[in-house]
């Protein structure tokens, strides 16, 4: 069975988060999608939504969220640039299908933005978080602003039981640090 | 330790199919996604497509596309790549590999990889 | 599709050489590249990813540079075990591809 997890992205202010989001293409390939953020108790909040239908491959940026959906392998990749403390937070990608309600893909994404000290000695300037380049097309796509209320979310299970980290062997500094945390709902 | 181990040689005739298997051991099999990757004999690396074991989901390159399914079995940690109506041109080593980041990450760098499968395809 | 191309596509140089292999994209890539070496009959094993960073385990004789559209890779001193083919392999969008490999014989 599919487990909803989460993972988790430590990183500096100013890196960029660069993740993806996989869907059952031959289902959604050209339906709309969107990155939404996750407050505790609240609704989730669609910061950026691909265009109706989705074009394949063609970049849609909103801010410094830039959003891109390969149809023909079922990937959404999501980049957030310059990265600010205020960005941490619980993420997801969903899908838009109307009138049915968003479907939501897997995994969540915990990001947690610290103060970073970029340019100083002992920083890690070749962080791949950092590499961002500008598309060569932008487009700002409208969003339905329906959320469902079904994907509010519990905090997941504070338990340090349920968390695994990366393989042991796998040297995580100019990646980024990930954990996995199984949500329960 | 990381370990895919592959399945057999296999020699088909054209038209037929083949399916391989790679059996994970050593880490949490849903965690991260297995891409396969072929090599015909002495010709260069052809990435094929991806797979996340979590949910099952899938994707390949044009090439592939009409002829290759990607599925796996949780309970026993194991991903199949299947490649229908075989051509001679299908000859060759075919490998499952392991990224080195979690599912959720943009980072399609080949960690762990299989020992390989040879395909050859042969009237 | 983004076009990988080697060079040279083979090398002869002898234990203790310097040697360079030089990988081109047909398009900015920023530090999306990986280094794979491998040996007759083996996998390929991962070196160097993201352009620059040393997989574990890997010697430090290895290096990679570069981004955009040009990347180096360096053995500082060539070993006996080194003698192999190297490939260079893009992700900065789908599909990825593999440049068609650097083979680095004994001299």
């Known amino acids: 069975a599919t487990k909803l997890t989460e993972e988790k992205y430590e990183l500096k202010e100013g890196q960029t988060l660069d993740v993806k989001c996989d869907y059952t293409l031959e289902k959604f390939a050209s339906s709309q999608k969107a990155w939404q953020i996750i407050r505790d108790g609240e609704m989730p909040k669609t910061l950026a939504c691909t265009e109706r239908p989705s074009k394949n491959s063609h970049p849609v940026q909103v801010g410094r969220i830039i959003l891109e959906d390969y149809h023909d392998h079922g990937l959404l990749r999501v980049r957030m640039v310059n990265l600010q403390v205020e960005d941490s937070g619980l993420y997801q990608c969903v899908i838009y299908q109307p009138p049915k309600e968003p479907h939501m893909l897997f995994d969540r994404i915990r990001l947690v933005v610290t103060k970073g000290f970029s340019g100083t000695p002992g920083s890690n300037e070749n962080s791949t978080q950092n590499v961002y380049k500008i598309p060569p097309t932008t487009t700002k796509a409208l969003c339905p602003l329906y959320t469902s209320p079904r994907t509010v979310t519990q905090a997941p299970p504070k338990s340090t039981a349920d968390v695994s980290t990366p393989d042991s062997e796998i040297n995580l500094t100019n990646v980024t640090d990930i954990i996995r945390v199984p949500v329960f709902n | 330790q990381v370990q895919l181990v592959q399945s057999g040689a296999e020699v088909k005739k054209p038209g037929a199919s083949v399916k391989v298997s790679c059996k994970a051991s050593?880490?949490?099999?849903?965690?991260?996604?297995i891409n396969w990757v072929r090599q015909a004999t002495g010709q260069g690396l052809e990435w094929m497509g991806w797979?996340?074991?979590?949910?099952?989901?899938?994707g390949s390159v044009k090439k592939f596309r009409d002829r290759v399914t990607m599925t796996r079995d949780t309970s026993i940690s194991t991903a199949y790549m299947e490649l229908s109506s075989l051509r001679s041109e299908d000859t060759a080593v075919y490998y499952c590999?392991?990224?080195?980041?979690?599912?959720?990450?943009?980072?399609?760098?080949?960690?762990?990889w299989g020992q390989g499968t040879l395909v050859t395809v042969s009237s | 599709d983004i076009q990988m191309t080697q060079s040279p596509s083979s090398l002869s140089a002898s234990v203790g050489d310097r040697v360079t292999i030089t990988c081109q994209a047909s398009?900015?890539?920023?530090?999306?590249l990986n280094w794979y070496q491998q040996k007759p009959g083996k996998a390929p094993k991962l070196l160097i990813y993201d352009a620059s960073n040393l997989e574990t385990g890997v010697p430090s004789r290895f290096s990679g540079s570069g981004s955009g559209t040009d990347f180096t890779f360096t053995i500082s001193s060539l070993q006996p075990e080194d003698f192999a083919t190297y490939y260079c392999?893009?992700?900065?969008?789908?599909?990825?591809?593999f440049g068609q490999g650097t083979r680095l014989e004994i001299k």
């Open positions: 590999v392991r990224l080195i980041g979690y599912s959720s990450a943009w980072k399609w760098s080949f960690q762990h």
């Open positions: 392999q893009h992700y900065d969008n789908i599909p990825i591809t």
């Open positions: 398009r900015d890539i920023s530090k999306y």
């Open positions: 050593g880490y949490t099999f849903t965690s991260y996604d």
């Open positions: 797979m996340n074991p979590n949910s099952g989901n899938s």
